[in-house]
């Protein structure tokens, strides 16, 4: 079997986790993809979904998560904006292909969000956001439901409140690449 | 064809205000995120300030903050950049660029901003 | 932010010279990386993304290589259009950030 990887990242909260999912363009361009939660013990769950068929570069923001797809290069752009403690957790994009079940992209993302001074750069970080406005709607695309034994994901959420609830412990172990990357504060 | 061009460049003294603008053309201007980057003459490039699709975001490079702002006007396919508080330090052509994701993928032909007495 | 070192910051050869030139990043940056050539008062022109792939309408004589921290820009025999300054560009990490430049000179 694939030893999945992980990459760590590790910010505080109010920052923005920024991260690229890179897929086989000529396969998967116009698909559906997604951004997953995945809790310890529980199939993965979707927060965030692309339209169907995925438009290029066109943002989808569901709360405070952004996707944006850039058909060319093959690239999923996930971002999470004013980050929580509780968003901590284990994260992956996936691709939809009914009705096969959804494809995986490498690799998973491990989040860690600490308290911190959201106004204040970190030691490592770099304070470079100077607005941040949260539009008055957001585009809540419709996401497949799945229910096959391996893999169950839902609908987007509501409320982003219970989108990342963290797990109660989390497990570092098989964390293979850790990269600190500097960040939006 | 992309199109990208920029003016509002010129000569300007320290401490002084300048206004570049960039009209694009040739796709659907409000789908992407856009950018300033500059070069000082003889130098290399630096990025400078990006703003999301919709506006709601800016960014900007620590050594502009405060005195440049970023902006767009979706409608009339137009980014800008409104330098105030101009030093010498700030002379450089900057070029509007397309974000793509992971790259700049389309660029203006620049417009030189020169902040001298 | 990630700091970008190209090397080496100029290269002198010929037409048909085989020429290489590295990127190196501060951290690791996956695969994010991008190469760019600007001639003297033109806009930087994009030849290579994501690493090694090779930007629509870009002569196959150019490729790129690398993952993590190391880069290579490859011209597998030098043209005479092809003098010219090439910049590396990471889009990992925010934010992004520019090597310094290597120029190809005439010999």
């Known amino acids: 079997a694939t030893k999945l990887t992980e990459e760590k990242y590790e910010l505080k909260e109010g920052q923005t986790l920024d991260v690229k999912c890179d897929y086989t363009l000529e396969k998967f361009a116009s698909s559906q993809k997604a951004w997953q939660i995945i809790r310890d013990g529980e199939m993965p769950k979707t927060l965030a979904c692309t339209e169907r068929p995925s438009k290029n570069s066109h943002p989808v923001q569901v709360g405070r998560i952004i996707l944006e797809d850039y058909h060319d290069h093959g690239l999923l752009r996930v971002r999470m904006v004013n980050l929580q403690v509780e968003d901590s957790g284990l994260y992956q994009c996936v691709i939809y292909q009914p009705p096969k079940e959804p494809h995986m992209l490498f690799d998973r993302i491990r989040l860690v969000v600490t308290k911190g001074f959201s106004g204040t750069p970190g030691s490592n970080e770099n304070s470079t956001q100077n607005v941040y406005k949260i539009p008055p709607t957001t585009t809540k695309a419709l996401c497949p439901l799945y229910t096959s034994p391996r893999t169950v994901t839902q609908a987007p959420p509501k409320s982003t409140a219970d989108v990342s609830t963290p797990d109660s412990e989390i497990n570092l172990t098989n964390v293979t690449d850790i990269i600190r990357v500097p960040v939006f504060n | 064809e992309v199109q990208l061009v920029e003016s509002g460049g010129g000569l300007v003294q320290p401490g002084g205000s300048l206004r570049l603008s960039c009209a694009a053309s040739?796709?659907?201007?409000?789908?992407?995120?856009m950018s300033w980057v500059r070069q000082a003459p003889g130098k290399g490039l630096e990025w400078v300030a990006n703003?999301?699709?919709?506006?709601?975001?800016?960014y900007y490079v620590d050594s502009v903050k405060g005195r440049f702002t970023i902006s767009r006007d979706n409608a009339k396919n137009s980014l800008y950049l409104q330098m105030n508080s101009l030093r010498a330090e700030d002379t450089a052509v900057y070029y509007c660029?397309?974000?793509?994701?992971?790259?700049?993928?389309?660029w203006g032909q620049g417009t030189l901003v020169t902040v001298s007495s | 932010d990630i700091q970008m070192t190209q090397s080496p910051s100029s290269v002198s050869a010929s037409v048909g010279d085989r020429v290489t030139i590295t990127c190196r990043a501060s951290?690791?940056?996956?695969?994010?990386l991008a190469w760019y050539q600007q001639k003297p008062g033109r806009a930087p022109k994009l030849l290579i993304y994501a690493a090694s792939r090779l930007q629509s309408g870009v002569p196959s004589r150019f490729s790129g290589s690398g993952s993590g921290t190391d880069f290579t820009l490859t011209i597998s025999s030098l043209r005479p259009e092809d003098f010219a300054t090439y910049y590396c560009l990471q889009a990992h990490g925010f934010p992004w950030t520019f090597g310094q430049g290597t120029k190809v000179e005439i010999k």
């Open positions: 660029a397309r974000d793509y994701g992971d790259v700049f993928d389309y």
């Open positions: 951290q690791g940056i996956r695969k994010w």
């Open positions: 040739g796709f659907t201007f409000s789908s992407y995120w």
């Open positions: 703003i999301k699709q919709d506006g709601s975001e800016e």
